[in-house]
Interface confidence: low
């Protein structure tokens, strides 16, 4: 008598979540008589998936009519596959008995479920940083299978390489999660920059998922300050301007001090954007020279985005302004450096 063979031709089958999986099994002989049963897993804890002989298995249907004579095809179809269905399935021949006696098992077919990763979610730093500093962005995506996945980071189309990526869990699982951190060095040009986390997976058919974050949420571009003085007007008033340039975000408060006393405070609002996304702001102060006997020390004090105030001071020389209309007088700059990096 020829020895019975239970043949599972495919070592593995991969199915997209939601689809149906066909698990093939044929036997080489109708003898001995006995049912075929399908199990997921091996050993004492195995799970019964289908029993040709009895039971109700709503998601499982036989491919061929098991009642048909000479049927040696005991393949099954499992509908509406989920990641929880992943595992190795065994087609097992039983010899008729009471109870039935397990005779022979097929080699097993590993069912892997291709589950799409969730849309990548990119989160940036909690606090803003300035140019030349490194900030971290995190990208997370969940629920995918199989485990193999590719995640790339881009900044303005250029791939980043200072990246640390982990896929969990390390062992076998029905589905996996990926978490990646990219370290990005900010430049003053980055207000309009964007980082993209791109996830490629077998389920996406070459159309990767992308999550984005704008560096505008992560960057602070400190302002440059420049104080200039216009020529004196006929009414002995000097127009002094404080130009605050190339800053981001817009949150900025400017205070004028005359000889250390607050003269006026202004808040920036509804400023037009520069091409690079930064803002400029100019504030004017009229100083009545004739009202002062001594030189006037003017300070333009700028507090940007909650950072320590930056000052630019200079003196208006009263002696340089006779009572008639004067010419252009350069302000004496006694302030801090024009480029304030904090």
């Amino acid at each position: 008598e020829e020895e019975l063979q239970v043949i599972q031709p495919e070592k593995s089958v991969s199915v997209a979540a939601g689809d149906s999986a066909t698990l093939n099994c044929t036997v080489s002989s109708l003898i001995p008589v006995g049912p075929i049963q399908w199990f997921r897993g091996a050993g004492p804890g195995r799970e019964l998936i289908y029993n040709l002989k009895e039971g109700h298995f709503p998601r499982v249907t036989p491919v061929s009519d098991p009642t048909k004579r000479n049927n040696m095809d005991f393949s099954i179809r499992i509908s509406n596959i989920t990641p929880a269905d992943a595992g190795t399935y065994y087609c097992v021949k039983f010899r008729k008995g009471s109870p039935d006696v397990e005779l022979k098992s097929g080699a097993g077919t590993e069912l892997s479920v291709r589950a799409k990763p969730s849309a990548p979610v990119v989160s940036g730093p909690a606090v803003r940083a300035t140019a030349e500093h490194t900030v971290s962005f995190t990208c997370e995506s969940h629920g995918f299978s199989p485990r193999d996945i590719t995640l790339k980071w881009f900044k303005n189309g250029n791939e980043l390489s200072d990246v640390q990526t982990n896929v969990d869990p390390a062992g076998k699982s029905v589905s996996y999660s990926i978490r990646s951190t990219a370290r990005v060095v900010l430049t003053r040009r980055d207000v309009h920059s964007q980082v993209i986390c791109e996830v490629a997976h077998v389920t996406l058919q070459g159309d990767p998922l992308r999550g984005t974050a704008n560096l505008s949420e992560a960057i602070r571009v400190p302002p440059f300050l420049e104080v200039t003085q216009q020529s004196m007007r006929a009414d002995n008033q000097v127009n002094v301007t404080c130009q605050v340039t190339k800053f981001y975000p817009q949150r900025l408060q400017l205070t004028w001090l005359e000889n250390g006393n607050v003269s006026r405070t202004e808040m920036a609002s509804a400023l037009p954007e520069n091409k690079d996304g930064t803002y400029n702001w100019t504030s004017w102060l009229l100083v009545n020279v004739s009202a002062h006997r001594d030189d006037v020390k003017l300070t333009c004090q700028v507090e940007h985005d909650g950072q320590p105030a930056v000052n630019k001071s200079f003196s208006v020389k009263v002696s340089a302004h006779p009572k008639e209309q004067g010419s252009n007088t350069a302000a004496e700059n006694t302030g801090t450096n024009e480029r304030n990096i904090y």
């Epitope: 030349e132 490194t134 390489s161 200072d162 370290r183 990005v184 060095v185 430049t187 003053r188 040009r189 190339k246 690079d276 480029r339």
Partner: antibody, heavy 115, light 111 residues
């Protein structure tokens, strides 16, 4: 504060070379290192910048053949598929342009591509 | 990519002369001020003079000054000194990080 290049020399066409730029007196960790070359009797030509961290960018003509990396004290530039027109003095300089200009510069290292 | 054109390619001048060198960009440089000037003497590495179009680098004599914005820039040496005879290069930066281009250089020679 100085930069010292090394690694130049004679190389055959198609060959590769790795140039080093070592800093003394300061750290490279918070600055980019830029590479500039100068062919004999010619002007300066910007090659690329190795940014803070590991971000690198190169002039369009240099992409693919030139790559770079950096530690806190040394920057490297790998030159591959070298051609005779790559013969030049190669300078490194601290900085990445705009408000971080190239300063200081190394003394340069001569790369000669010839069979 | 941005292109930088320097003129003249050479200039002859005497000690004490006021010398003006120009640099023109094919498009506005980044921020209208991404322009630096470098001085190079034979057999030496370049030396930074001016950056951000008009900011004098540390240790550079005040006779050097830079001006200009957008596409047109000027380096002025108010009173030429013997040590100033050299080749001067401008370096302009476009909107892309890697778009940094030197001009062809201007050689300042003794008349």
């Amino acid at each position: 504060r100085q930069l010292v290049e090394s690694g130049g020399g004679l190389v055959q066409p198609g060959g590769s070379l790795r140039l080093s730029c070592t800093a003394s007196g300061f750290s490279l960790s918070s600055h980019g290192i830029s590479w500039v070359r100068q062919a004999p009797g010619k002007g300066l030509e910007y090659i690329g910048t190795i940014g803070t961290g590991v971000i690198t960018y190169f002039a369009s003509w240099a992409k693919g053949r030139f790559t770079g990396s950096k530690t806190s004290s040394t920057a490297y530039m790998e030159l591959s598929s070298l051609r005779s027109e790559d013969t030049a003095v190669y300078f490194c300089a601290r900085g990445s342009a705009w408000n971080d200009p190239f300063d200081p510069w190394g003394q340069g290292t001569l790369v000669t591509v010839s069979s | 990519d941005i292109e930088m054109t320097q003129s003249p390619s050479s200039v002859s001048a005497s000690v004490g002369d006021r010398v003006t060198l120009t640099c023109q960009a094919s498009q506005s440089v980044y921020g209208n001020n991404d322009l630096a000037w470098y001085q190079q003497k034979p057999g030496q590495a370049p030396k930074l003079l001016i950056y951000l179009a008009s900011t004098l680098a540390t240790g550079v004599p005040s006779r050097f000054s830079g001006s200009g914005s957008g596409t047109d820039f000027t380096l002025t040496i108010s009173s030429l000194q013997p040590e100033d005879f050299a080749t001067y290069y401008c370096l302009g930066g476009g909107d892309d990080e890697a778009d940094n281009v030197f001009g062809g250089g201007t050689k300042v020679e003794i008349k």
